[in-house]
């Protein structure tokens, strides 16, 4: 991390543009020139964390599945009594089969009725949802995509005309600073422009603004 960035973090007011020291700083400064640079997580650590999260998720899913199995078992044990065939004669077994078949038929009837109710409810929900959309004037939410964008472009997009003033003010501040540190920055020139050019930000910015 560049020394200037840690100083900037301690400053209450906007810090001056840092002196060119390390090329790895550029992208960070281009996107967040006045914020403290966050420490980067190494790829191996990222992978480790991802694996850990996946493991936790897997364990959670397994636990949920186990809970569901247990719940199903409990439900079945209350609904389906164990077969107590010891000592029952052929007559009783036949009778029992008839009883169980009758029970199955009854459960099937109940299941059919419940399915009919569910279907009716689904249809009603669909109708009501449609009515809600009709009342909203058939408004459709746009699908949001992640866009890589510079802070300035974002400001411009969010604030519109007011952002222009903010940008001009920033440019003015830079000019004042430039006079103070002209020697140091002569080689660098306008570092923001350089970075925008390097990262293709200028083109993106124009596209975004248009």
């Amino acid at each position: 991390m560049a020394d200037g960035s840690s100083d900037a973090a301690r400053e209450p007011r906007p810090a001056p543009a840092p002196i060119r020291r390390r090329s790895s700083n550029y992208r960070a400064y281009a996107t967040e020139p006045h914020a403290k640079k966050k420490s980067k997580i190494s790829a191996s650590r990222k992978l480790q964390l991802k694996t850990l999260l996946l493991q936790i998720a897997k364990q959670e899913l397994e636990r949920e599945a186990e809970e569901r199995r247990g719940e199903k078992g409990r439900a079945l044990s209350t609904r389906c009594q164990p077969l107590e065939l010891a000592g029952l004669g052929f007559a009783e077994l036949q009778d029992l089969c008839r009883q169980l078949h009758a029970r199955v038929d009854k459960v099937d009837e109940e299941r059919y009725d419940i399915e009919a109710k569910v279907t009716k409810n689904i249809t009603e929900i669909a109708d009501l949802t449609q009515k809600i959309f009709d009342l909203r004037g058939k408004f459709k939410r746009p699908t949001l995509r992640r866009v890589r964008i510079s802070a300035d472009a974002m400001m411009q997009a969010l604030l519109g005309a007011r952002a222009k003033e903010s940008l001009d003010l920033r440019a003015h501040l830079k000019q004042v600073k430039k006079e103070d540190t002209e020697k140091e920055n002569r080689e660098v020139g306008d570092w923001r422009k350089n970075i925008d050019a390097l990262s293709g930000m200028e083109g993106r910015k124009k596209k975004f603004e248009s």
Partner: antibody, heavy 120, light 113 residues
Framework: EVKLEESGGGLVKPGGTLKLSCAAS????????MSWVRQTPEKRLDWVAT????????FYPDSVKGRFTISRDNARNTLYLQMNSLRSEDTAMYYC?????????????WGQGTLVTVSA | DIVMTQSPSSLAMSVGQKVTMSCKSS????????????LAWYQQKPGQSPKLLVY???TRESGVPKRFKGKGKGTKFTLTISSVQAEDLADYFC?????????FGAGTKLELK
């Protein structure tokens, strides 16, 4: 030695209720299906009710269905017969009987019986 | 319901004689899957409770003397006492264990001459 001992019989008026008990010993009560069988004064034998080893399955003839209830308490090794809305034709000697082993058939053991008299 | 018909209703025999009693069912008691006939025979001596003699139409219960022999299949069954003894004086009932309601025959009374 298998022993079945009925109790609870007596004289009751038509429409009355009575609860018979059968205390079992000499075998693993909870492993066997049990039944009540009655014998009329004319010596005719009538099957009254059957209950499975754990009490989940119950069987009755139409003549007593809805009036009589068979139950068991495996912890106490006792079989019960709750008799409601008694009629004069229910007058009989009531026997509790243990079913045979699963690979066999018939009522292997019978108690000495308890007499139920339904009369005004 | 399966109706069980026993005959004769009573018979008088002398000790040592052979006796045969009959039991007919209104429908077959044969379970085709195991080829077993679900019929039992019981003996009830005066003042006592019934005692199982034979099950599956021909299988003697343990402890039952060999003189008692059950036969038959389908709807026709017999119980034969090869040599009647004084202690055999009793009522004999057949019972079907094929379907509910379980039903008994009216019985055959064995008396001694």
């Amino acid at each position: 030695e298998v022993k079945l001992e009925e109790s609870g019989g007596g004289l009751v008026k038509p429409g009355g209720t009575l609860k018979l008990s059968c205390a079992a010993s000499g075998f693993t009560f909870s492993s066997y299906a049990m039944s009540w069988v009655r014998q009329t004064p004319e010596k005719r034998l009538d099957w009254v009710a059957t209950i499975s080893s754990g009490g989940s399955y119950i069987f009755y003839p139409d003549s007593v269905k809805g009036r009589f209830t068979i139950s068991r308490d495996n912890a106490r090794n006792t079989l019960y017969l709750q008799m409601n809305s008694l009629r004069s034709e229910d007058t009989a000697m009531y026997y509790c009987a243990r079913h045979h082993n699963p690979d066999k058939s018939g009522f292997a053991y019978w108690g000495q019986g308890t007499l139920v008299t339904v009369s005004a | 319901d399966i109706v069980m018909t026993q005959s004769p209703s009573s018979l008088a025999m002398s000790v040592g004689q052979k006796v045969t009693m009959s039991c007919k069912s209104s429908q077959s008691l044969l379970n085709s899957s195991n080829q077993k006939n679900y019929l039992a025979w019981y003996q009830q001596k005066p003042g006592q409770s019934p005692k199982l003699l034979v099950y599956f139409a021909s299988t003697r219960e343990s402890g039952v003397p060999k003189r008692f022999k059950g036969k038959g299949k389908g709807t026709k069954f017999t119980l034969t006492i090869s040599s009647v003894q004084a202690e055999d004086l009793a009522d004999y009932f057949c019972q079907q264990h094929y379907s509910t309601p379980l039903t008994f025959g009216a019985g055959t009374k064995l008396e001694l001459k």
